[in-house]
C-alpha cells in the first residue's frame, strides 16, 4: 500500500468557502471565467465544523473533486471507510476506471457508487473495469477492512450522450453558498419546473435555510406552487407550500430542490443559504446501514 494517498492533478479541487454554480449545458470553466453565478453569502454559523475547512488533508478520503480528470488513490487510507465525491457540470457524465484493486470481496470489502441514478455495490472483476455514471456527480465509497488495501482510480468526464436536465436546472458544489430560485423566462416557461442540485463533500450533510415569498394559492393540479427538497440518499422528500421560512437538513451529501411550474408562473421567489453539517453517520458506511433507508 501507499503511505501517502495522492490526487492528481490538484490536491484540492474546491477551495473552502467557494460555491460553483453552473446551469445545465454550461461548462465549469465557462462559469468560473464569468465569475460566480450566485455570489457567496456570508458564511453562516455551523453547528459543527465543516469537513472541507482543513487546509491540509493527508488522505484522499472526504474530498470533493471538480476537475475534468484525476487520479484518486484510496489504497491504505488508514480507515475502513473512505469516500470521495466527483462533481462535473450538468450535461456531463463521470467515467471511472479501476487501475488497481486489492479488495478482499470474501471478507466484505467493496466499492459503493452513489449518484442521482446510481446505487451500485461492486467488488468482483473490478480491475480495468470502466464505469460510467448516468449523471454529473458520483460518490465513491470504499469499504476495506485490511490496512493497505484499496483501489486506485482514474476518473474522467465527457458530455452525456443524452441529458435529462432542463435548461433552467442548476448545480451547486462546495461547502456553502447562496440559493436563489430561477425566475420565469423563455427557458423556464415550458420546463415543467426547474431543479437545483447541491453536492458537498461525502462525509457532510446539507443544511438549507431560506425564505419563500409570493408562493401563490395554488396547491393542486398543474399550477400548484411548491418547492420539493429530496435527499438523494434516503429519497426522503419534503414539500413546502406557501410563504414561509424553511429549514431543512439532509441525511447525506446530495440534495435536489425542485421548483414547480406553478411556482415559476406565480413569480414566486426563494432566497437563502446552504451550508454543511458534520454527518452523524457516514452515508453508506456499512451495507447494513442501507437497511430501512429505502422508501419515502
Amino acid at each position: 500500500g501507499q503511505g501517502t494517498p495522492s490526487l492528481v492533478p490538484h490536491e484540492e479541487a474546491a477551495a473552502p468557502g467557494r460555491t460553483t454554480a453552473t446551469p445545465a449545458g454550461a461548462s465549469l470553466e465557462w462559469s468560473q471565467a464569468r465569475g460566480l453565478l450566485f455570489s457567496p453569502a456570508p458564511q453562516p454559523r455551523r453547528l459543527l465544523p465543516g469537513p472541507q475547512e482543513n487546509s491540509v488533508q493527508s488522505s484522499a478520503c472526504g474530498r470533493q473533486h471538480l476537475e475534468p480528470t484525476g487520479t484518486i488513490d484510496m489504497r491504505g487510507p488508514g480507515q475502513a471507510d473512505c469516500a470521495v465525491a466527483i462533481g462535473r457540470p450538468l450535461g456531463e457524465v463521470v467515467t471511472l476506471r479501476v487501475l488497481e484493486s486489492s479488495l478482499n470481496c470474501s471478507a466484505g470489502d467493496m466499492l459503493l457508487l452513489w449518484g442521482r441514478l446510481t446505487w451500485r455495490k461492486m467488488c468482483r472483476k473490478l480491475l480495468d473495469m470502466t464505469f460510467s455514471s448516468k449523471t454529473n456527480t458520483l460518490v465513491v465509497r470504499q469499504r476495506c477492512g485490511r490496512p493497505g488495501g484499496g483501489v486506485l482510480l482514474r476518473y474522467g468526464s465527457q458530455l452525456a450522450p443524452e441529458t435529462f436536465y432542463r435548461e433552467c436546472d442548476m448545480q451547486l458544489f462546495g461547502p456553502w453558498g447562496e440559493i436563489v430560485s430561477p425566475s420565469l423566462s423563455p427557458a423556464t416557461s415550458n420546463a415543467g419546473g426547474c431543479r437545483l442540485f447541491i453536492n458537498v463533500a461525502p462525509h457532510a450533510r446539507i443544511a438549507i435555510h431560506a425564505l419563500a415569498t409570493n408562493m401563490g394559492a395554488g396547491t393542486e393540479g398543474a399550477n400548484a406552487s411548491y418547492i420539493l427538497i429530496r435527499d438523494t440518499h434516503s429519497l426522503r422528500t419534503t414539500a413546502f407550500h406557501g410563504q414561509q421560512v424553511l429549514y431543512w437538513e439532509s441525511e447525506s451529501s446530495q440534495a435536489e430542490m425542485e421548483f414547480s411550474e406553478g411556482f415559476l408562473k406565480a413569480q414566486a421567489s426563494l432566497r437563502g443559504q446552504y451550508w454543511t453539517l458534520q454527518s452523524w453517520v457516514p452515508e453508506m458506511q456499512d451495507p447494513q446501514s442501507w437497511k430501512g433507508k429505502e422508501g419515502t
Epitope: W119, K121, R195, L235, E258, W290, E294
Partner: antibody, heavy 122, light 107 residues
Amino acid sequence: QVQLVQSGGGLVQPGRSLRLSCAASGFIFDDYAMHWVRQAPGKGLEWVSGISWNSGSIGYADSVKGRFTISRDNAKNSLYLQMNSLRAEDTALYYCAKDPNSLYRSGSFDYWGQGTLVTVSS
Amino acid sequence: ELQMTQSPSSLSASVGDRVTITCRASQSISSYLNWYQQKPGKAPKLLIYAASSLQSGVPSRFSGSGSGTDFTLTISSLQPEDFATYYCQQSYSTPYTFGQGTKLEIK
C-alpha cells in the same frame, strides 16, 4: 448474456401457499437488486416486491404486504417469492426482474424473466 | 400511492408514422420515469429510463422527454416490430406504479 429462468407457478386453491423461484445467470447476481412484477390476465403491470443486493432492504406493494415474502440466496444466484394466504385476485403472470442498481429503490427493471403463471381458484 | 395515467389507451398508426404517447403522474416525479414495450406473450422490455435516456440496444427512433408530471414517448418512424403495448412507470417512490398501457396497432 443475462438470463432469468422462472419456476414454481401453477394452480392453487384460495388460502393456500406457493413459492416462486427465479434462477439468474450471466451477471454478478449479488451486485444487483431484484424485483417481482405481476400482470393479471389481459391487464397491466403491477410491482409486487423488491429486494436489495444483500437483503438489507425490502419493499412490498400494499396488496401483498403481510402475505408475500421476497428473499434471495446469493450463493445460489436465486430469487424467491413465498406467497401465503393466496386470493383469487393474486391470479397473474409473475415476472422476476433485475434492477440495474444494487438498491431496490432504484425502481427500474432492465431484464425480465419469462414469467410464471399463478392461478388461484377453487 | 402515485397514479400514472397514459393516453391514449389505444392508437392506430402506419409504418413510417411518427407516434407520441403521453404519461401523466399524479404528482411531480422529477425525471424518475421509465418506458417499457411489451409484445403479446412476451416479457416487457426497458426502452427509456430517467425520462429521456435510451437503454442500451434500443433503436434511436425511440425517444423520451418530459419532467415533473408530464412525459412523452416518441417513435420517430414506426417499424413493423414496434406494434406492441407501451407502459410508463415511475421510479420516484415505492410502491412503483405503472400506467395502464397504450396499445399501438397497425392501421
